[in-house]
């Protein structure tokens, strides 16, 4: 089930997922001057069975200069500005992505993809927060957020993180040592 809202915004912090739950969708966005190939996929979709998960469909971009009637997927300047802060941060490759059952790893980049990735998360997804460069993390609890569903409405839990303006950055979990995150929670309705 798709999360119909976004992970919370924490001042001076960014978030990312270590792995993506089955059902997660990634928009096939192209950088400026390029567009999705005609009849190309709109999304990549994390799918799988009990033993293996992988991304279905491939995103492919082609130069907008070539004549084609397909509508451009590349955002126009105004739209580009809006999209900068949407859904997920830039396509970074986490150092460690534990092989959780029912999860996909970060998809590899495709040629001429947009600078920002737009993910559509599903219920049960967990994202991790870290302070941006120049800010230090003050933890009151886990620096993570989970998408939960209650009464048919989705919401993200509030990460217990404050970023204070002192040099020294914290790391995402798993960037020090490999570990499985407690992300594979059942995708069930939270009791009302």
């Amino acid at each position: 089930e798709l999360c119909d809202d976004d992970p919370p915004e924490i001042p001076h912090a960014t978030f990312k997922a270590m792995a993506y739950k089955e059902g997660t969708m990634l928009n096939c966005e192209c950088k400026r001057g390029f567009r999705r190939i005609k009849s190309g996929s709109l999304y990549m979709l994390c799918t799988g069975n009990s033993s293996h998960s992988s991304w279905d469909n491939q995103c492919q971009c082609t130069s907008s200069a070539t004549r084609n009637t397909t509508k451009q997927v590349t955002p126009q300047p105004e739209e580009q500005k809006e999209r900068k802060t949407t859904e997920m941060q830039s396509p970074m490759q986490p150092v460690d992505q534990a092989s959780l059952p029912g999860h996909c790893r970060e998809p590899p980049p495709w040629e001429n993809e947009a600078t920002e990735r737009i993910y559509h998360f599903v219920v049960g997804q967990m994202v991790y927060y870290q302070c941006v460069q120049g800010y230090r993390a003050l933890h009151r609890g886990p620096a993570e957020s989970v998408c939960k569903m209650t009464h048919g409405k989705t919401r993200w839990t509030q990460p217990q993180l404050i970023c204070t303006g002192e040099m020294e950055t914290s790391q995402f979990p798993g960037e020090e040592k490999p570990q499985a995150s407690p992300e594979g929670r059942p995708e069930s309705e939270t009791s009302c």
Epitope: D5, L45, E82, V123, G152, K153, E187
Partner: antibody, heavy 116, light 106 residues
């Protein structure tokens, strides 16, 4: 209480455009996505797309990507959907519906009739 | 896109009847949601996440199913229940609805 109030019925000529509004009250407008759904006469429901009022980000059903443009005005708690290059097939009732999961609140619907 | 196929399209029934509407998804989905619509009115949320009744919905309505096959049941049809019912998936974009099942007076 939560309310979504849509603009009145419109009659338009083929080739023209129309902008339907949906004014939200009773909740924090920027906390929920606003979705739009179409229902042609005697037909079922079709999802058009949504907007995140907080950021202006939109996601569309590919079928309506060239037809609909969804916007929002945070200052007036109003979402808009503009339909361009109208054709007779665009005659339908258009609904806004509050997101954040299932559509628990709907506007009353706006009938757009395209006729020469 | 995930196609949603409801059956039957029209159902003729009498007050007191037990009514069952099925909805089949072209791919496996997490949950099914159901809406009720009366002529000239906006749809109304009836059942969410397959089996949970929306606020104010009578207990004669129930939902079940998993994967690709889902069911809406009205245990004893009441006069207020004559309407059109739509199943809905929001497991993947584009969000899709079934074509509707009209429950009419026999």
């Amino acid at each position: 209480q939560v309310q979504l109030v849509q603009s009145g019925a419109e009659v338009k000529k083929p080739g023209s455009s129309v902008k339907v509004s949906c004014k939200a009250s009773g909740y924090t407008f920027t906390s929920y996505r606003m979705h739009w759904v179409r229902q042609a006469p005697g037909q079922g429901l079709e999802w058009i797309g949504y907007i995140k009022p907080s950021r202006g980000y939109t996601e569309y059903n590919q079928k309506f990507k060239d037809k609909a443009t969804i916007t929002a005005d945070k200052s007036t708690n109003t979402a808009y959907m503009e339909l361009s290059s109208l054709r007779s097939e665009d005659t339908a009732v258009y609904y806004c519906a509050r997101g954040g999961g299932v559509f628990d609140y709907w506007g009353q619907g706006t009938l757009v009739t395209v006729s020469s | 896109d995930i196609q949603m196929t409801q059956s039957p399209s029209t159902l003729s029934a009498s007050v007191g009847d037990r009514v069952t509407i099925t909805c089949s998804a072209s791919s496996s989905i997490s949950y099914m949601h159901w809406y009720q619509q009366k002529p000239g009115k906006a749809p109304k949320l009836l059942i969410y996440t397959t089996s949970n009744l929306a606020s104010g919905v009578p207990a004669r309505f129930s939902g079940s199913g998993s994967g690709t096959e889902f069911t809406l049941t009205i245990s004893s049809l009441q006069p207020d229940d004559f309407a059109t019912y739509y199943c809905h998936q929001r497991s993947t974009y584009p969000l899709t609805f079934g074509q509707g099942t009209k429950v009419e007076v026999k």
